[in-house]
Amino acid sequence: MAVTACQGLGFVVSLIGIAGIIAATCMDQWSTQDLYNNPVTAVFNYQGLWRSCVRESSGFTECRGYFTLLGLPAMLQAVRALMIVGIVLGAIGLLVSIFALKCIRIGSMEDSAKANMTLTSGIMFIVSGLCAIAGVSVFANMLVTNFWMSTANMYTGMGGMVQTVQTRYTFGAALFVGWVAGGLTLIGGVMMCIACRGLAPEETNYKAVSYHASGHSVAYKPGGFKASTGFGSNTKNKKIYDGGARTEDEVQSYPSKHDYV
């Protein structure tokens, strides 16, 4: 039960985390105009990974995409790559983890296969979370560097001609969304890895079988013992008459209304 809960919770936490990583990647507010200690402007600038936007006090907002690949800073390209890799790994991890969930029964998938899939998805979530955290952190570092550079040189020549007060940028909402989302995906991945340990079958090739003292009414069905050991794949033979041998795990193995999604 604890394993199922850990696995389910890990899946949900990772799902929220990946949704957050996608949201952060799409958000325009990775960097926002620094308003502190600046003249009050009627124009507010903010930038994302894909476009930069200007919101006027009139309420009009104009966004322009970065329609160049080669002209963009290498750091921005690296951040984009990290976020996309994070999303792709996370999406694959989600797909794998759906089939690995203990509460979902697909054909005759063995616990060992589910354990492997849980571990795979867990590792994918961890790497996905790390990619997101790394991407956001690289961007944040870039902002801090640029912020102090522009503070040291508040007036800069635009195109070498016009003297203009340089717009300084600070952390936008997307950075915080990205950090939290990356952290959640990482936590979800760790939970999946922990759940994998509980799902993995024992080292021995047979399970402990408990025999109950039985009276003359006991009738063993052919193949009944085989099913009771847990190695048989024929589920029709799995249920043994009361009083017969039963594995410790088999109590949970009967199909119930909760086994199908």
């Epitope: 105009q33 402007t41 124009v43 936007c53 200007v54 006027e56 009139s58 309420g59 007060v165 717009t167």
Partner: antibody, heavy 118, light 113 residues
Framework: EVMLVESGGGLVKPGGSLKLSCAAS????????MSWVRQTPEKRLEGVAT????????YYPDTVKGRFTISRDNAKNSLYLQMSRLRSEDTAVYYC???????????WGQGTSVTVSS | DIVMTQSPSSLTVTAGEKVTMTCKSS????????????LTWYQQKPGQPPKLLIY???TRESGVPDRFTGSGSGTDFTLTISSVQAEDLAVYYC?????????FGAGTKLELK
């Protein structure tokens, strides 16, 4: 057709108060930032107050800060300017205007005259 | 506050003549985010409120004749009327639309000879 109609102007003694109103029609008032601009007898233009579409932002120059209050009622499509502690230098024609692209004032009312004199 | 300086204060012209008036701001009105200059030009005729002519330093408001042209960047801006008509006689104001308070110039009065 866009229309802005100011009212509430008049003669007031120094230190007195006055509330100007502006009735808007012909555009989406609730989505527009609005401003009050005054024109002195010497024909100089001065922005006295600005309010954002969602009431979240208001701005006043130092000359009127603490004395003037801009507000809006989106349900009534109305803009207001509460003026208190009026001075003789507040004598002007007060215009209500809508902010458009580039923060430019694209529509103006006909103005209402305010005279501060003892 | 941003100081807007307009020159000349008045211009006497003849119909059909080309007219140029300038506006200087004490700080750059160029926004690095969209590379637009937040400078606006208005026309005010006697007994009327100001009328928007040009915003973003060079974008004509709809309905404004194409004889009106705005140019300039940063701190120096120009309004040009390619061929003055009788109905163009008015006072022209420039406005800083970038920094609060959104300040106006003192105006340039266009008069007929």
């Amino acid at each position: 057709e866009v229309m802005l109609v100011e009212s509430g102007g008049g003669l007031v003694k120094p230190g007195g108060s006055l509330k100007l109103s502006c009735a808007a029609s012909g555009f989406s008032f609730s989505n527009s930032a609005m401003s009050w601009v005054r024109q002195t007898p010497e024909k100089r233009l001065e922005g006295v107050a600005t309010i954002s579409s969602g009431d979240s932002f208001t701005y006043y120059p130092d000359t009127v800060k603490g004395r003037f209050t801009i507000s809006r009622d989106n349900a009534k499509n109305s803009l207001y300017l509460q003026m208190s502690r009026l001075r003789s230098e507040d004598t002007a024609v007060y215009y209500c205007a809508r902010q458009g692209y580039g923060n430019a004032l694209d529509y103006w009312g006909q103005g209402t005259s305010v005279t501060v004199s003892s | 506050d941003i100081v807007m300086t307009q020159s000349p204060s008045s211009l006497t012209v003849t119909a059909g003549e080309k007219v140029t008036m300038t506006c200087k701001s004490s700080q750059s009105l160029l926004n690095s985010g969209n590379q637009k200059n937040y400078l606006t030009w208005y026309q005010q005729k006697p007994g009327q409120p100001p009328k928007l002519l040009i915003y973003w330093s060079s974008t004509r408001e709809s309905g404004v004749p194409d004889r009106f042209t705005g140019s300039g960047s940063g701190t120096d801006f120009t309004l040009t009327i390619s061929s003055v008509q009788a109905e163009d006689l008015a006072v022209y104001y420039c406005q800083n639309d970038y920094y609060y308070p959104l300040t106006f110039g003192a105006g340039t009065k266009l008069e007929l000879k």
